[in-house]
């Protein structure tokens, strides 16, 4: 929280390129920060003719662009890769595109997930 103590945050984690990059595909990421450093959650995605392709989600290092954002809202007009970041546990579960230049707001809801079976 940037006030002398280390911050801990939990974010939704996802990596579309998980096989190549040798990571988990999805889950929860627990982020533990350094003293006086903030931590954020982020989401990134592509929009191919209205089809949303999730790229990455997870923890994002201290970044003033993410300060005090309760919701994950991308504001760039038409990037190849959309990006949003926010502060608050699991705030990257839902993400929105709201271009600064105006235009329709599009919110992406995560698909309902089946309960994980622990064996």
């Amino acid at each position: 929280s940037g006030r002398g103590e280390a911050e801990t945050r939990e974010c939704i984690y996802y990596n579309a390129n998980w096989e190549l990059e040798r990571t988990n595909q999805s889950g929860l990421e627990r982020c533990e920060g350094e003293q006086d450093k903030r931590l954020h959650c982020y989401a990134s995605w592509r929009n191919s003719s209205g089809t949303i392709e999730l790229v990455k989600k997870g923890c994002w290092l201290d970044d003033f662009n993410c300060y005090d954002r309760q919701e994950c809202v991308a504001t760039e007009e038409n990037p190849q890769v959309y990006f949003c970041c926010c502060e608050g546990n699991f705030c990257n579960e839902r993400f929105t595109h709201l271009p600064e230049a105006g235009g329709p707001e599009v919110t992406y809801e995560p698909p309902p997930t089946a309960p994980t079976l622990l064996t």
Epitope: N17, E21, T23, C31, G58, L61, F83
Partner: antibody, heavy 120, light 107 residues
Framework: QVQLVQSGAEVKKPGASVKVSCKAS????????ISWVRQAPGQGLEWMGW????????NYAQKLQGRVTMTTDTSTSTAYMELRSLRSDDTAVYYC?????????????WGQGTTVTVSS | DIQMTQSPSSVSASVGDRVTITCRAS??????LAWYQQKPGKAPKLLIY???SLQSGVPSRFSGSGSGTDFTLTISSLQPEDFATYYC?????????FGGGTKVEIK
């Protein structure tokens, strides 16, 4: 303070192997990744690969696949990079660097570099 | 692989000058971009991460901007210790790749 200390310079013959070490101190070794980057004389930086000391996961640059192995020893907080079948164009300064486990994964602390010379 | 192209490859400048270095990615990398400074015989040093976040301990005369494919490193008022080579690097997808470097020389 946080630092990475690398092993000393090496001179090797073509076809030989080299193993460079990188000892970490001042932070929790398993909370960060380690990347290896090399720089040939007068050239730019080339990323070689990455390892997670937490679980041993590795990711190597395609051009080095099959010749490079990255390992860690968590008991001594040391990372290792072994390069086999050395060629003259492997002559370079080899750096280890600490990598944040969180996006966008900058390399925030670097070792001093290890010069590897491959010459017959 | 994502190609990173830096320009110019070298720039001559004087103390106090404003210096701008650009980096272009061959495809969108959002904000997964870092800038490093390297002096002869030394290891690189992280200046900027996430395209615009200043690393702890780095002077505020360094700033980064950009997103997607086009990025900029600016030194607002060049100091004697800033003469060095600067590299951009993407970490959006493996293999991570660096730009070719920009050497900032004394005019």
């Amino acid at each position: 303070q946080v630092q990475l200390v690398q092993s000393g310079a090496e001179v090797k013959k073509p076809g030989a192997s080299v193993k460079v070490s990188c000892k970490a101190s001042g932070y929790t070794f398993t909370s960060y990744g380690i990347s290896w980057v090399r720089q040939a004389p007068g050239q730019g930086l080339e990323w070689m690969g990455w390892i997670s000391p937490y679980n041993g996961n590795t990711n190597y640059a395609q051009k080095l696949q099959g010749r490079v192995t990255m390992t860690t020893d968590t008991s001594t907080s040391t990372a290792y990079m072994e390069l086999r079948s050395l060629r003259s164009d492997d002559t370079a300064v080899y750096y280890c660097a600490r990598v944040s486990m969180y996006a966008p994964e900058p390399m925030d602390v670097w070792g001093q570099g290890t010069t590897v010379t491959v010459s017959s | 692989d994502i190609q990173m192209t830096q320009s110019p490859s070298s720039v001559s400048a004087s103390v106090g000058d404003r210096v701008t270095i650009t980096c272009r990615a061959s495809q969108g990398i959002s904000r997964w971009l870092a800038w490093y400074q390297q002096k002869p015989g030394k290891a690189p040093k992280l200046l900027i991460y996430a395209a615009s976040s200043l690393q702890s301990g780095v002077p505020s005369r360094f700033s980064g901007s950009g997103s997607g494919t086009d990025f900029t490193l600016t030194i607002s008022s060049l100091q004697p210790e800033d003469f060095a080579t600067y590299y951009c690097q993407q970490a959006f997808s493996h293999p991570w790749t660096f730009g070719g470097g920009t050497k900032v020389e004394i005019k």
